[in-house]
């Protein structure tokens, strides 16, 4: 498992050529985990979905998602997390023309179908913590974050910088 | 509702060809990995090849691998399976299967069979 | 090639509990799927991932997997549950199922 420290060099080398905010960055397939190992697994139907959040059985293939790296136009207030000063924002896909969304209302993190561009909801600011490890910050709603609730996905509010460090807002993103 | 139909099933002399179709409706067919599964006459369930995207994920049993060929046609909702140098031993009734969940970037197929249609009988004899 | 195995029949009285086993070398790595098939129709999923259940199956199906071995457990059987059932797994993109279980409502 790994930061973003990778593709942060990835994509300084694409910085100059690329469009803010419009066309991403860089897009990387890798498998999404949380901090205690258990594996992300999306099981989508057309009219219904489930993400589960286990221990994967030894035989079986980690799901990948696509992540599209994003610089955000607005400079990033902390340093780590951003390429030349910018912060970086991911949305994230685990099949074609589907992406996360933050429902703030519900708290919860779904799955929707929707042509580009992309609304807010599907954005996420991207934080390179500890451990390898990141987290995923909701861009419309600032201090809430993608975590684990009851071995589901869900939106965690984080009240204070010590608490985002707490295990069940970090991640680990895995090539295999 | 989602609908699997199978045609294409006959008589064929041993050697010979033939290609099944599975005209899929009621989902969104692009986004599934498909499967064939076949069953002799009072035998058990056999799988024999499995499709991902278009044509660089494809599957094949040992027994049928270099004689069938799966492909699909997302423009027209439809699975084949084209079987040449056909042997007594490929008799049964062919199922088209779909696989219960869409396909995740990791590729491949994404078991289980979560839906099937109503079979189309394949008999090679002379 | 991988090999699941599976009991030829099973009995079992109306109202009673049917298991069915499937084994196959380390099983419990692997996620189990069960099928049943009446006489005359195409095979219907009825346990997926070990214990999950399609919509539209009865909670009267359950399922279970570790070790070497996964169950399909009938509680409660019914004249309709008469049937051949078939395990299966995935391995590496190839699809295996058991030789079938004819199950018997006496």
């Known amino acids: 498992a790994f930061g973003i420290s990778g593709v942060q060099k990835y994509t300084r080398a694409l910085h100059d050529s690329s469009i803010t905010g419009i066309s991403p960055i860089t897009e990387y397939l890798a498998s999404l985990s949380t901090y205690n190992d258990q594996s992300i697994t999306f099981a989508l139907e057309d009219e219904s979905y489930e993400i589960y959040v286990e221990d994967l059985k030894k035989d079986e293939k980690k799901d990948k998602v696509l992540l599209s790296y994003y610089e955000s136009q607005h400079p990033s207030n902390e340093s780590g997390d951003g390429v030349d000063g910018k912060m970086l924002m991911v949305t994230l896909s685990p099949t074609k023309d589907f992406w996360l969304h933050a429902n703030n209302k519900e708290h919860s993190v779904e799955l929707h179908k929707c042509e580009k561009p992309l609304p807010d909801q599907a954005f996420f600011v991207l934080h390179n913590m500890h451990s390898n490890c990141v987290s995923f910050e909701c861009k419309t709603d600032p201090g809430v974050f993608i975590g684990v609730k009851d071995n589901h996905l869900a939106l965690i509010k984080v009240d204070s910088s010590e608490n985002l460090c707490t295990e069940n807002i970090l991640f680990k993103l895995s090539e295999t | 509702e989602v609908q699997l139909l199978e045609s294409g099933g006959g008589l064929v002399q041993p050697g010979g060809s033939l290609r099944l179709s599975c005209a899929a409706s009621?989902?969104?067919?692009?986004?599934?990995?498909m499967s064939w599964v076949r069953q002799a006459p009072g035998k058990g369930l056999e799988w024999v090849s499995g499709?991902?995207?278009?044509?660089?994920?494809?599957y094949y049993a040992d027994p049928v691998k270099g004689r069938f060929t799966i492909s699909r046609d997302n423009s027209k909702n439809t699975l084949y399976l084209q079987m040449n140098s056909l042997r007594a031993e490929d008799t049964a009734v062919y199922y088209c299967?779909?696989?219960?969940?869409?396909?995740?970037?990791?590729?491949?197929?994404?078991?289980?069979?979560?839906?099937w249609g109503q079979g189309t009988m394949v008999t090679v004899s002379s | 090639s991988y090999v699941l195995t599976q009991p030829p029949s099973v009995s079992v009285s109306p109202g009673q509990t049917a298991s069915i086993t499937c084994s196959g070398e380390?099983?419990?790595?692997?996620?189990a799927a069960w099928y049943q098939q009446k006489p005359g129709q195409s095979p219907v999923l009825v346990i997926y991932?070990?214990?999950k259940r399609p919509s539209g199956i009865p909670e009267r199906f359950s399922g279970s997997n570790s070790g070497n071995t996964a169950t399909l457990t009938i509680s409660g059987t019914q004249a309709m549950d008469e049937a051949d059932y078939y395990c299966?797994?995935?391995?590496?993109?190839?699809?295996?199922f058991g030789g079938g279980t004819k199950v018997t409502v006496l």
């Open positions: 299967a779909r696989d219960l969940w869409m396909m995740n970037y990791a590729g491949g197929l994404r078991y289980p069979f979560g839906y």
């Open positions: 009621g989902f969104t067919f692009s986004s599934y990995a």
């Open positions: 499709i991902a995207d278009d044509f660089t994920s494809t």
């Open positions: 380390r099983m419990g790595d692997k996620y």
């Open positions: 991932r070990d214990t």
């Open positions: 299966g797994v995935l391995k590496q993109d190839t699809g295996v």
